[in-house]
């Protein structure tokens, strides 16, 4: 993480403050995940194109009563354009497969680490 | 059927002040991210800005950041691009773009052209 | 900065022919690369999303592939109403910085 900063800052709050908050949280979900996170909860699997944000809030959001998981939903409305609610989605969704939330957080921070290393941010 | 008209448009001397608008119709405005996308004359696309759907974020392109500044208000289902220290090579048409959660732009207006 | 280079600049071909346009990225975009349509004194058209998905009311025609650093449109077989310029456009990941094509 020490290597992401450095980035331009043309919003509110520097790009590079941001992604490092969000995965600086989805980070301390996998790692202090003891039970079930979101107990077991199922959501749609997203593509994980420059998109995402938006698609990975429209699937999160449809999970409610999970406290852990309620500041990653916060910080994903940063990073997404548009008003997302609960029963939205868009064709980034893979609506026919559905994974368990600890899955799709691990995948979403695999990803964004993936990114990272192949210098896919500004 | 979604549609955007830019206003606003016209010609103006090197170092003045310029505001474009664009009046939306046919969504919801306040739900979505909006653009400004121009096009100098015989030339390609150029992205300037973009604001969220509530106007908490907005990113410019290097090319007009501290000099545009993009707003919206979303109870007139208006967007704007207040436009100072204007330069010759900011001629172009401007057109207000609305995007989507996975395609950035999807929806386009006819565009205005400042001179 | 990711920088989009389209071949040929320009591409001379009939109706009922095949056209194939190439979009090359300076560095990978992953599937993220669209492809907008413009006739004169038009605004642009969205054709393609995510390298190879149709928008809505786009022609089965049109088809798009491609992903890392090289995307081709393919206009399997040209309509008179086709004739126009191609753009390509990708987005970064974060912060959302949108780029385009010198257009083809």
């Known amino acids: 993480l020490t290597c992401l900063g450095g980035f331009a800052s043309p919003g509110p709050v520097p790009p590079s403050t941001a992604l490092r908050e969000l995965i600086e949280e989805l980070v301390n979900i996998t790692q202090n995940q003891k039970a079930p996170l979101c107990n077991g909860s199922m959501v749609w699997s997203i593509n994980l194109t420059a998109g995402m944000y938006c698609a990975a809030l429209e699937s999160l959001i449809n999970v409610s009563g999970c406290s852990a998981i309620e500041k990653t939903q916060r910080m994903l409305s940063g990073f997404c354009p548009h008003k997302v609610s609960a029963g939205q989605f868009s064709s980034l969704h893979v609506r026919d497969t559905k994974i368990e939330v600890a899955q799709f957080v691990k995948d979403l921070l695999l990803h964004l680490k993936k990114l990272f290393r192949e210098g896919q941010f500004n | 059927e979604v549609q955007l008209v830019e206003s606003g448009g016209g010609v103006v001397q090197p170092g003045r002040s310029l505001r474009l608008s664009c009046a939306a119709s046919?969504?919801?405005?306040?739900?979505?991210?909006m653009h400004w996308v121009r096009q100098a004359p015989g030339k390609g696309l150029e992205w300037v800005a973009i604001i969220w759907y509530d106007g908490s974020n907005k990113y410019y392109a290097d090319s007009v950041k501290g000099r545009f500044t993009i707003s919206r208000d979303n109870s007139k289902n208006t967007l704007y691009l207040q436009m100072n220290s204007l330069r010759a090579e900011d001629t172009a048409v401007y057109y207000c773009v609305k995007g989507s959660g996975d395609i950035p732009f999807d929806y386009w207006g006819q565009g205005t052209l400042v001179t | 900065e990711i920088v989009l280079t389209q071949s040929p600049a320009t591409l001379s071909s009939s109706p009922g022919e095949r056209a194939t346009l190439s979009c090359r990225a300076s560095?990978?975009?992953?599937?993220?690369l669209a492809w907008y349509q413009q006739k004169p004194g038009q605004a642009p058209r969205l054709l393609i999303y995510d390298a190879s998905n149709r928008a809505t009311g786009i022609p089965a025609r049109f088809s798009g592939s491609g992903s890392g650093t090289d995307f081709t449109l393919t206009i399997s077989s040209l309509e008179p109403e086709d004739f126009a310029v191609y753009y390509c456009?990708?987005?970064?990941?974060?912060?959302?910085?949108?780029?385009f094509g010198p257009g083809t």
């Open positions: 560095q990978s975009v992953s599937s993220y």
């Open positions: 456009h990708q987005r970064s990941h974060w912060p959302p910085i949108f780029t």
């Open positions: 046919g969504f919801t405005f306040s739900n979505y991210g």
